[in-house]
Amino acid sequence: FERTRSLQDPCSNCPAGTFCDNNRNQICSPCPPNSFSSAGGQRTCDICRQCKGVFRTRKECSSTSNAECDCTPGFHCLGAGCSMCEQDCKQGQELTKKGCKDCCFGTFNDQKRGICRPWTNCSLDGKSVLVNGTKERDVVCGPSPADLSPGASSVTPPAPAREPGHSPQ
């Protein structure tokens, strides 16, 4: 790496992946192993995070970017930069202090994380329940009861396709 020639700050030309080495007359030196600099002009390289223990490596550290961690199988990340791991549950469950518990009746969870949420109340939108909810799935709301003529199916059939140039009868 050449010595930089900037008149203002000789370190400003040191690119990412290097640091401005005061011990070597401000020459741009490459980051040592297991360290990185993600921006130019840095006077030190940061030590890479190690994904050990409850964490595993999702992306290796390079000279210009830090390592990225995720959690071991059966767990998912929480917090900025995956600072914590939380146990996965099955769909239809939520994590409590005592472990994974089934969603109570009237609630659902369609993911392996998070909490059980109440089924949608179709009647609040003036609609009816088209498909019942389960522990894993929300209800599906359909047309309002008033939209259905007596004896008509709650599932509206598709309108027939009209040919161009023909006005409706």
């Epitope: 995070r49 190690q50 767990f75 146990q87």
Partner: antibody
Framework: QVQLKQSGPGLVQPSQSLSITCTVS????????VHWVRQSPGKGLEWLGA???????DYSAAFMSRVTINKDNSKSQVFFKMNSLRPDDTAIYYC????????????WGQGTSVTVSS | DIQMTQSPASLSASVGETVTITCRAS??????LAWYQQKQGKSPQLLVY???TLADGVPSRFSGSGSGTQYSLKINSLQPEDFGSYYC?????????FGGGTKLEIK
């Protein structure tokens, strides 16, 4: 409740090896890691190494050539061995649990006081 | 290796006072910092992890804060049972080193 109980000798001859057993209860070693730390008047608290739920280990580079950590999940026991002891290895040696949610030491054993002397 | 520098090394305070202990890392440790309390003749006990999260059962008068390389542990309204030694430890990259400790004594 969670407990870590340590057993091991109090006195070790120089150049001999140290073996400590950490017997855990209230949790399973298949789900939790265990660290080993020592505390000496001269050097304070030092992390020595850890064994993880899957059986893989990490060691401090300063002790890698002398320390071995193993475990027996079925007996809920973790085994710590350090070779070629010197007088400056005199310290209290602790095992400590690593929780499942992040890397930290949330429960500690009572400690094993080790003196290296002839 | 990342070095942890803790200050002050010792501290005298009275019951009811507020004290702050600081820990400086030699490099960025991204909030992967724990604080432990140790009473004379006992094993360390976890107080705070990830810089600011209180461990289960730890009184709310304890609080952790900080980012990057600078971290602190604050104890509001000191109680008699709070006197002892305090240590920080990082979990960024091995070896997971500890600070030198702060001995909190009763005035």
């Amino acid at each position: 409740q969670v407990q870590l109980k340590q057993s091991g000798p109090g006195l070790v001859q120089p150049s001999q090896s140290l073996s400590i057993t950490c017997t855990v209860s209230g949790f399973s070693l298949t789900n939790y890691g265990v660290h080993w730390v020592r505390q000496s008047p001269g050097k304070g608290l030092e992390w020595l190494g850890a064994i993880w739920s899957g059986g893989n280990t990490d060691y401090s580079a300063a002790f890698m050539s002398r320390v071995t950590i193993n475990k027996d999940n079925s007996k809920s026991q973790v085994f710590f061995k350090m070779n070629s002891l010197r007088p400056d290895d005199t310290a209290i040696y602790y095992c400590a649990r690593n929780p499942y949610y992040t890397n930290v030491m949330d429960y500690w054993g009572q400690g094993t006081s080790v003196t290296v002397s002839s | 290796d990342i070095q942890m520098t803790q200050s002050p090394a010792s501290l005298s305070a009275s019951v009811g006072e507020t004290v702050t202990i600081t820990c400086r890392a030699s490099g960025n440790i991204g909030n992967f910092l724990a604080w432990y309390q140790q009473k004379q003749g006992k094993s360390p006990q976890l107080l705070v992890y990830n810089g600011e999260t209180l461990a289960d059962g730890v009184p709310s008068r304890f609080s952790g804060s900080g980012s990057g390389t600078q971290y602190s542990l604050k104890i509001n309204s000191l109680q008699p049972e709070d006197f002892g030694s305090y240590y920080c430890q990082h979990f960024w990259s091995t070896p997971w080193t500890f600070g030198g400790g702060t001995k909190l004594e009763i005035k």
